[in-house]
């Protein structure tokens, strides 16, 4: 359909990260149209011939889809008419990283926006008290990271202290030969203190906290994606 004389519509994307082996979302929103058949969504990837995904006339059109995305993409169909063109990407691969373009055409106009999609692996750390050690120690474990992250310890009581001398970190390659298990042990811990294990790469930052007292152990963890 023609859009001559129509204006450019605002398309907005958000840099995001995909966790290898899991499902991810490439976010894109646009000025909505009131009719579904007026909306065309095309997702393209830099360096790839063919389309990542196309949605038009209320249906997916995968006739020009590149084979690396076959069976792995979907739009949130019920949300298209309210301006959501985000793409669901199943089973994220390391090779999915790159620059994507979300291109929108509606009966009101057209527009596009790029997004950087980073891929890697990130997971929540779990800290446990290691009672087997000769002195009381803490063991921080996170099952899946890539690229190799940095690990640092911190403590509420000894703020600013460098724990590298009293900790030991190892990275163990997982069976798929890409992601790694992170294990870090902090020795000589004191009771009635809160310790934090911080794992970070260029995609994500995860923190595990543990508070050890005479009567109980309290844990908390959080994961934050770095949209840099």
């Amino acid at each position: 359909f023609g859009i001559s004389g129509k204006h450019f519509i605002t398309v907005t994307t958000f840099t995001s990260a995909g966790n290898i082996g899991e499902d991810g979302t490439l976010s894109c929103t646009f000025e909505p149209d009131i009719k579904l058949n007026g909306i065309v969504i095309q997702w393209l990837k830099e360096g790839i011939k063919g389309l990542v995904h196309e949605f038009k006339e209320g249906k997916d059109d995968l006739s020009q889809q590149h084979e690396m995305f076959r069976g792995r993409t979907a739009v949130f169909a019920d949300q298209v008419v309210v301006g959501n063109a985000s793409l669901r990407l199943k089973n994220v691969q390391l090779t999915d990283a790159g620059t994507y373009t979300c291109y929108i055409r509606t009966s009101k106009g057209k527009g596009n926006a790029n997004l950087e999609y980073k891929t890697g692996a990130f997971s929540m750390p779990e800290i446990n008290v290691d009672y087997n050690a000769s002195s009381e120690s803490l063991r921080c474990e996170a099952p899946r990271w890539f690229p190799q992250p940095t690990v640092a310890w911190a403590s509420q009581v000894d703020q600013g202290a460098n724990f590298s001398e009293v900790s030991n970190t190892s990275f163990e390659l997982n069976s798929e030969n890409v992601t790694m298990k992170v294990v870090s042990v902090l020795y000589n811990v004191t009771i009635n203190n809160t310790y934090s294990c911080m794992i970070e790469n260029d995609i994500a930052k995860a923190t595990g906290d543990i508070k050890v007292t005479d009567s109980e152990v309290k844990r908390r963890s959080q994961l934050q994606l770095l949209n840099s």
């Epitope: 204006h7 000025e31 909505p32 009719k35 579904l36 209320g58 249906k59 949300q79 008419v81 301006g83």
Partner: antibody
Framework: QVQLVQSGAEVKKPGASVKVSCKAS????????MHWVKQAPGQGLEWIAA????????DYNQKFKGKAKITAVTSTSTAYMELSSLRSEDTAVYYC??????????WGQGTMVTVSS | EIVMTQSPATLSLSPGERATLTCKAS??????VAWYQQKPGQAPKLLIS???YRYTGVPDRFSGSGSGTDFTLTISSLEPEDFAVYYC?????????FGGGTKVEIK
């Protein structure tokens, strides 16, 4: 929470005009289409037109072109529909409704317009 | 314009019974159909969007299905508050159009 509050009932003489308002709150007024729907007494629903306040784009049902004119004032988050050259068949409840997360997910309470000589 | 035809016009049922309301589009509208419930003196309320997505807060006895030209709203077991008029509506193309409505009344 999202709310659409419409102006009160109107009684008009044939040939006159009426302007119905719909004040929106609880969401970003400029980011979503506002629609107007007619329901004549004992009848079904009829879509009149819609406006996108972000850029004042409008879409009209051909049947209501020349009858209805819709506008939006972003500073007050209010949409308006003016009906001109009123006739008895324009007697109806008029609803404003918006599409925030789904189609027509929020509705105004309706404005009864009665055309009578 | 796309014509939406609802049937039956009236459905007389008892509480606890299953209600099946149909809506037929005059051309393919993909999944772009919503269902609304309207009670006397009230504005319509969204029940189902995009043919089968139950709107927030709508009881799970309401379900929608269909794509293309044939759509169904099912109320698995009628509650007293479900007796009302139900409308289907397409947002595939303009003008947006509604069906004529199905009145579900107490038998």
């Amino acid at each position: 929470q999202v709310q659409l509050v419409q102006s009160g009932a109107e009684v008009k003489k044939p040939g006159a005009s009426v302007k119905v308002s719909c004040k929106a709150s609880g969401y970003t007024f400029t980011s979503y289409w506002m629609h107007w729907v007619k329901q004549a007494p004992g009848q079904g629903l009829e879509w009149i037109a819609a406006i996108y306040p972000g850029n004042s784009d409008t879409d009209y049902n051909q049947k209501f072109k020349g009858k209805a004119k819709i506008t939006a004032v972003t500073s007050t988050s209010t949409a308006y529909m003016e009906l001109s050259s009123l006739r008895s068949e324009d007697t109806a409840v008029y609803y404003c409704t918006t599409t925030v997360a789904h189609y027509f997910d929020y509705w105004g309470q309706g404005t009864m317009v009665t055309v009578s000589s | 314009e796309i014509v939406m035809t609802q049937s039956p016009a009236t459905l007389s049922l008892s509480p606890g019974e299953r209600a099946t309301l149909t809506c037929k589009a005059s051309q393919d509208v993909s999944f772009a159909v919503a269902w609304y419930q309207q009670k006397p003196g009230q504005a319509p309320k969204l029940l189902i969007s995009s043919a089968s997505y139950r709107y927030t807060g709508v009881p799970d006895r309401f379900s929608g299905s269909g794509s293309g030209t044939d759509f169904t709203l099912t109320i698995s077991s009628l509650e007293p508050e479900d007796f009302a008029v139900y409308y289907c509506q397409q947002h595939y193309n303009t003008p947006l159009t509604f069906g004529g409505g199905t009145k579900v009344e107490i038998k």
